[in-house]
């Protein structure tokens, strides 16, 4: 399971239109359910209901994006529609480059998205948790335009990180 | 289907408003950032605005910043564009998009003129 | 604001000919790099995407290509559906940029 270093930035907006560019490091765990490889794009976060729709009309959002999603406390969700590595499928056949899970809640997702597959996802499948995943979270909240950097290896400069 | 129908284009004086619509279906547009984009007549496009899903994040150019206003109404699955001040440069068909430009609308018609 | 180059501004081809029309992005812009075909009177269509990656639908004789900040499109084996303009755009940072459009039409 090796380490995938995320990068997130985030265009903060006045009303006046004017932005301001944060960039915020953290890092996760490329699981085995997907590639390991890099990747990039706006980020889109999803509710895991939200990935429970079945309409074919709904099987292309948009290209290369990132999902995001908040995994909740199994307890909350006894039965879900589909299992996480169905989630993360799901959000790759709607145009995702990408998934990240934080699984702070439901650790046992762990689990679940390293039992190895025979058909692995081509796209990345990471997954964060503690301070990591509410750094992420708090970026992903704050409903401003965010893109994530997806990257196997440190990233080659160091980049100045502001604390969200 | 994606599909995103503009409305609310017309004949309007300069220095006058306009209030543009888009109207999404076919997709969870709550999850998606939009943007309006425009093209003048015979010439390339041009970006106007981007609104990020939840509505807290809007960006602009220059050239319309402090003028028009992006908004939307997920409960409704629509996209605004609200332009005042209107300059005859602003004449141009206005098209929403997904905030990626995958999928476009068939634009609605702005002319500026007295 | 970054500044998207385009060029050239018209391409007369062939039928069966292989064009590469070219976008040269003044700063860094990764992969968000994406191609645009509109025909007249019609909507734009998004032909790639991440710079290399083909848009579904997209016909496989169209593909994208970066080297440095040189971004290309190129189409193989022309066909008289390809004739229209094409847009390049970055959404790497706002303000968001397109080229200013190559009309590739018939020689």
């Known amino acids: 399971k090796e380490t995938a270093f995320v990068e997130v930035v985030l265009f903060e907006s006045s009303p006046s239109g004017d932005y301001t560019t944060y960039t915020t490091g953290l890092t996760g765990r490329f699981s085995r359910a997907g590639a390991t490889l890099s990747a990039e794009g706006e980020i889109v976060q999803m509710h895991p209901l939200g990935l429970c729709n079945n309409n074919d009309e709904e099987d292309l959002y948009e290209y290369g994006w990132v999902g995001v999603v908040k995994l909740e406390q199994p307890e909350l969700d006894p039965k879900p529609c589909l299992t996480v590595l169905g989630k993360a499928k799901r959000a790759v056949q709607r145009g995702a480059t990408a998934v990240i899970f934080d699984v702070s809640e439901n650790p046992e997702a762990i689990d679940q998205l390293n039992q190895g597959s025979e058909d692995p996802l081509k796209r990345p499948v990471v997954y964060v948790k503690g301070a990591d995943a509410i750094k992420l979270m708090n970026i992903v909240n704050k409903q401003k335009v965010a893109r994530a950097r997806i990257q196997h290896r440190p990233p080659r400069q160091p980049t100045e990180y502001f604390d969200m | 289907e994606v599909q995103l129908v503009e409305s609310g284009g017309g004949l309007v004086q300069p220095g006058r408003s306009l209030k543009l619509s888009c109207a999404a279906s076919?997709?969870?547009?709550?999850?998606?950032?939009m943007a309006w984009v425009r093209q003048a007549p015979k010439k390339g496009l041009e970006w106007v605005a981007s609104?990020?899903?939840?509505?807290?994040?809007?960006y602009y150019p220059d050239s319309v910043k402090g003028r028009f206003t992006i908004s939307r109404d997920n409960a409704k699955s629509t996209l605004y564009l609200q332009m005042d001040s209107l300059r005859s440069e602003d004449t141009a068909s206005y098209y929403c998009?997904?905030?990626?430009?995958?999928?476009w609308g068939q634009g609605t018609l702005v002319i500026v003129s007295s | 604001d970054i500044q998207m180059t385009q060029s050239p501004s018209s391409l007369p081809a062939s039928l069966g000919d292989r064009v590469t029309i070219t976008c040269r992005a003044s700063?860094?812009?990764?992969?968000?790099l994406r191609w645009f075909q509109q025909k007249p009177g019609k909507s734009p269509r998004l032909m790639i995407y991440?710079?290399?990656s083909l848009a579904n639908g997209v016909p496989s004789r169209f593909s994208g290509s970066r080297s440095g900040s040189d971004y290309s499109l190129t189409i193989n084996n022309l066909e008289s559906e390809d004739m229209a303009i094409y847009y390049c755009?970055?959404?790497?940072?706002?303000?968001?940029?397109f080229g200013t459009g190559t009309k590739l039409e018939l020689k």
């Open positions: 076919g997709f969870t547009f709550s999850s998606f950032t």
């Open positions: 991440g710079a290399t």
């Open positions: 609104i990020s899903s939840g509505g807290g994040g809007t």
């Open positions: 998009a997904t905030g990626g430009f995958a999928y």
């Open positions: 700063q860094d812009i990764g992969s968000y």
């Open positions: 755009l970055q959404h790497n940072e706002f303000p968001y940029t």
